[in-house]
Interface confidence: medium
């Protein structure tokens, strides 16, 4: 389907591209001695970038330093020093720049204050960092200010003394609404969930914490859980891990009504050294990792039903290190239902797996065309692609970036990888898929930084090197052909690529520093590709593409989770602008139902290589640990439940006699009768 990538030779060379790019390359030298630089985009499509440089000298007792703040309003082409707007104050980088949600234009910077001060200090802006207001806080913040997703004027923060503080006017005034708080999170509709310790401290009370909720910013409270170890929010689900009565194990409980009622998740309990982790969640379902006992470094992925209660085993031996907390689990956002992760084999080798149907089936990644199997392969002709992600990065392998995909660059996935029987420790190459992970091709030799611009119209890459660099590579045909552009005569030590989140921009900023025996100087080069993609794309530049198509002759070809989608995609040969307003054009069509569209309900399972759900052999001799809404249940089921998000209609309807599985509730987790409300007086 696609040839091996070429760099410059044999490729459709873009006419005059050097002149076009040279005229659109903007250098900015930062006149300071800072040791680190952090960059944040403020708002969407505003062109506003804030750059905070910090110069810090750590000493035994304290550290002293200075910050400089720069602002660009043209996507990084020019910067203005606005340090005076924050009174030349030293900004605490561990809190970063707290940028408000959506296009609120809000920014909060947390300042370093002297030891004896009563509270911290913040600088607040609500006009995209044009102006800042200094505000002294009545507490010392422990965490970055958290914006409510629904109302950016509402903020919460934890203090160093474990107080929960809330502001209703974008940080101008603050009120402590609760003490002894361990963890706090915004939920939907400006609800705040938080855990409190009752006796000693957050650490000492782990497993004996209480989970509270306030729906009115601290006027009234409701205790919605006791014996809590931790809690989390994912999609429309609220999860809590709760200590068991009898021993030191804990179980996951789920609520879909903000904690009013709880159900015990049909998941294994975990011991003290184990953990649960929500890998991904949406409005339909959740991927949950359950750690294996012992320090194995792996566990099991389970996928939930639409209630978050019934779980199907999805993937065994899923790599998730307990030590560093690293997992390679990656949501491929450029194609619905696709996820990539790593498993740990019996021989301790690591292998990549991909699912195209939201965890229903996992398989190895197909070997890229024209590629050779490496030394890890037993059979030199049969092997697969293995993707480097967070785990490889944590192991200091030569992997500068995790896999990349963008929702508006349909089907495109870029990742470092190796071709063999397992992940290799050798220097990786960069691979690209243009069909959401079904097929792959080598895109670039050796490790690179990469980014997607103009919704996939341009891919930009920079070689990962210890030496100073001055070349940027770009492709206008989804990584098949590459052009090289020398963006500066004086090579720089490269520190990062920055492009506006969302991959709609045509600007890329190359960050780095020049360093001599005298000094280090931060510098950014912003390259605008607008003149490379001279014209706007037209109808003829797009072609229809059926996602998930593996067997064009089959009437069910492309059906995933009960429906198929046809996309309009840019032709590889078209050199044109998708533009900032580009919207992915897709046409969904419903598929007839088959047994694959159903998961087995509680008390049922699918024997291996079977498609029908059969009742578990009476689960003889022990009661089922199943508890719905915290009370004894008459669970009626026909053994099947539609997979969350599945839209199939007609076809096979797995009707069978409806069984009444009367089960005793073994969860003592917070009966509604035990729930109490409190007022904040």
């Amino acid at each position: 389907r696609r040839g091996a990538p070429a760099e410059d030779q044999d490729c459709g060379r873009l006419p005059d591209f050097i002149a076009k790019l040279t005229n659109n390359t903007h250098q900015h030298v930062f006149d300071d001695l800072s040791g680190s630089v952090s960059l944040s985009w403020v708002g969407d499509s505003t062109g506003v970038i804030l750059v905070l440089t910090t110069f810090q000298v750590p000493l035994v007792i304290v550290s002293f330093g200075q910050s400089k703040l720069y602002r660009s309003e043209d996507y990084g082409k020019n910067f203005k020093d606005i340090t005076n707007l924050i009174n030349n104050t030293f900004i605490r980088t561990e809190f970063g720049m707290a940028i408000g949600p959506e296009n609120s234009g809000k920014v909060i910077l947390t300042a370093e204050v002297s030891g004896g001060s009563r509270g911290g200090r913040v600088f607040r802006s609500s006009d995209f960092a044009k102006n800042f207001v200094q505000t002294d806080l009545p507490f010392h913040p422990l965490t970055q200010m958290m914006y409510s997703p629904q109302n950016s004027d509402y903020l919460l923060a934890l203090s160093t003394e474990n107080g929960l503080w809330v502001s209703k006017n974008f940080g101008e005034k603050w009120e402590e609404i609760h003490k002894a708080v361990c963890l706090a999170k915004w939920g939907p509709n400006n609800i705040i969930f938080f855990t409190t310790h009752v006796n000693g401290s957050c650490k000492a009370d782990l497993g004996a914490l209480e989970l509270w909720r306030t729906s009115d910013l601290g006027k009234t409270f409701k205790t919605i859980g006791v014996k809590i170890y931790s809690f989390g929010l994912g999609g429309r689900f609220l999860f809590a891990s709760v200590m068991a009565d009898k021993d030191t194990t804990r179980r996951i409980h789920v609520s879909t009504d903000q904690g009013d009622t709880w159900s015990m998740a049909q998941l294994p309990s975990v011991g003290q050294e184990q953990f649960y982790s929500i890998l991904a969640a949406n409005e339909d379902m959740v991927f949950m990792h359950v750690d294996e006992p012992g320090d194995t470094g792996f566990g099991t992925i389970f996928t939930s039903d639409d209630r978050g209660i019934v779980y199907s085993k999805s993937l065994d031996r899923h790599l998730y290190t307990t030590t560093g907390g690293e997992t390679d689990f990656t949501n491929v956002t450029s194609l619905r239902g696709v996820y990539i992760t790593s498993t740990l084999s019996e021989d301790n080798s690591i292998q990549s797996m991909i699912t195209f149907d939201q965890g229903g089936r996992w398989e190895h990644l197909r070997k890229p065309e024209n590629s050779k199997c490496d030394a890890t392969a037993k059979n030199k002709n049969e092997c697969s692609l293995h993707i480097h992600a967070s785990y490889s990065i944590s192991q200091k392998l030569n992997v500068p970036m995790a896999p990349l995909s963008e929702p508006n660059a349909v089907g495109i996935v870029i990742a470092h990888g190796s071709v063999g029987d397992a992940i290799s420790v050798m220097v990786p190459d960069v691979y690209i898929s243009d069909d959401g992970g079904y097929s792959w091709a080598k895109m670039l030799e050796g490790p690179h930084y990469y980014t997607i611009l103009d919704s996939g119209g341009i891919i930009v890459a920079i070689e990962h090197s210890n030496r100073p660099i001055n070349v940027i590579k770009f492709s206008t045909d989804e990584g098949q052909c590459w052009q090289s552009y020398v963006f500066t005569q004086e090579p720089i030590y490269f520190t990062g690529l920055a492009s506006e989140p969302g991959a709609r921009s045509m600007n890329i900023s190359i960050w780095g520093f020049t360093e001599s025996f005298i000094t280090r100087q931060w510098v950014s080069y912003t390259v605008d590709f607008k003149d490379i993609l001279e014209r706007n794309c037209e109808e003829d530049d797009y072609t229809t593409w059926l996602a998930h198509s593996t067997d064009p002759g089959d009437y069910k070809d492309g059906c995933i989770l009960g429906y198929k989608e046809q996309f309009l995609r840019l032709r590889k040969s078209s050199v044109c602008q998708n533009g900032r307003d580009y919207v992915v054009a897709k046409q969904p069509s419903v598929c007839p139902c088959s047994l694959e569209d159903f998961l087995c309900d509680f008390g049922y399972f699918r024997p291996e290589n079977a498609s029908e759900c059969v009742e578990q052999p009476e689960l003889k001799g022990h009661e089922l640990e199943f508890c719905l809404y915290g009370k004894e249940e008459h669970l009626t089921t026909n053994g099947y439940r539609k997979i969350p998000g599945d839209k199939c209609q007609g076809g096979m309807n797995p009707a069978r006699e409806v069984k009444d599985l009367k089960k005793k509730c073994t969860s003592n987790f917070l009966n509604p009768t035990k729930q109490n409300s409190k007022s904040n007086s």
Epitope: L33, V57, E515, F517, I518
Partner: antibody, heavy 119, light 108 residues
Framework: EVQLVESGGGLVQPGRSLRLSCAAS????????MHWVRQAPGKGLEWVSG????????GYADSVKGRFTISRDNAKNSLYLQMNSLRAEDTALYYC????????????WGQGTMVTVSS | EIVLTQSPGTLSLSPGERATLSCRAS???????LAWYQQKPGQAPRLLIY???SRATGIPDRFSGSGSGTDFTLTISRLEPEDFAVYYC?????????FGGGTKVEIK
């Protein structure tokens, strides 16, 4: 404790050579550029030479160019100054200095090592 | 090279008085790259001010720096007995790095 200790100074005849060493401790030596500064008796400070963290960039004062060579061994946390064709005007107290961050002024200085060039 | 000229060469003042030391550059120097040092007899120089106006760690607030372009000033608001020493300015903007000739602050 951040410390720089110079050694290798002494009395030497004009035209001869000397090698100064600077042993660094208490900080990540390989992260910083390093410098040599000298001070003739009763005179002011004169920068002699500087070397970047990875030895990729080196500079010298005009007065020592072609005669002095700066080098470093990050594995040994050591900075060196090879001084050839010494002259009477090179007589000075030689300081090794560390910059405040990866660039900039010098926040840590050694105690100095005296070089006397005389026949 | 950038030549830094310090004036006066010697400043005779009494404890408690204010000292104003000047450093003039032969060409413009970014304030980020200008520093001041104090040196006492038999001791290595000590960094006082970096970035033209930022005090180094442990430096009392009676020391302050200001200026930009070609003119920079070190001010000691109230001289203490331990402040009598030689003061040097330095630029680290371009190679070669250069120091001023120094200003000696002596007890009157």
């Amino acid at each position: 404790e951040v410390q720089l200790v110079e050694s290798g100074g002494g009395l030497v005849q004009p035209g001869r050579s000397l090698r100064l060493s600077c042993a660094a401790s208490g900080f990540t030596f390989g992260d910083y550029a390093m410098h040599w500064v000298r001070q003739a008796p009763g005179k002011g400070l004169e920068w002699v030479s500087g070397i970047s963290w990875n030895s990729g960039s080196i500079g010298y004062a005009d007065s020592v160019k072609g005669r002095f060579t700066i080098s470093r061994d990050n594995a040994k946390n050591s900075l060196y100054l090879q001084m050839n064709s010494l002259r009477a005007e090179d007589t000075a107290l030689y300081y090794c200095a560390k910059p405040l961050y990866r660039g900039g002024p010098f926040d840590i200085w050694g105690q100095g090592t005296m070089v006397t060039v005389s026949s | 090279e950038i030549v830094l000229t310090q004036s006066p060469g010697t400043l005779s003042l009494s404890p408690g008085e204010r000292a104003t030391l000047s450093c003039r550059a032969s060409q413009s120097v970014s304030s980020s790259y200008l520093a001041w040092y104090q040196q006492k007899p038999g001791q290595a120089p000590r960094l006082l001010i970096y970035g033209a106006s930022s005090r180094a760690t442990g430096i009392p607030d009676r020391f302050s720096g200001s200026g930009s372009g070609t003119d920079f000033t070190l001010t000691i608001s109230r001289l203490e007995p331990e402040d009598f020493a030689v003061y040097y300015c330095q630029q680290v903007a371009v190679s070669p790095i250069t120091f001023g000739g120094g200003t000696k602050v002596e007890i009157k």
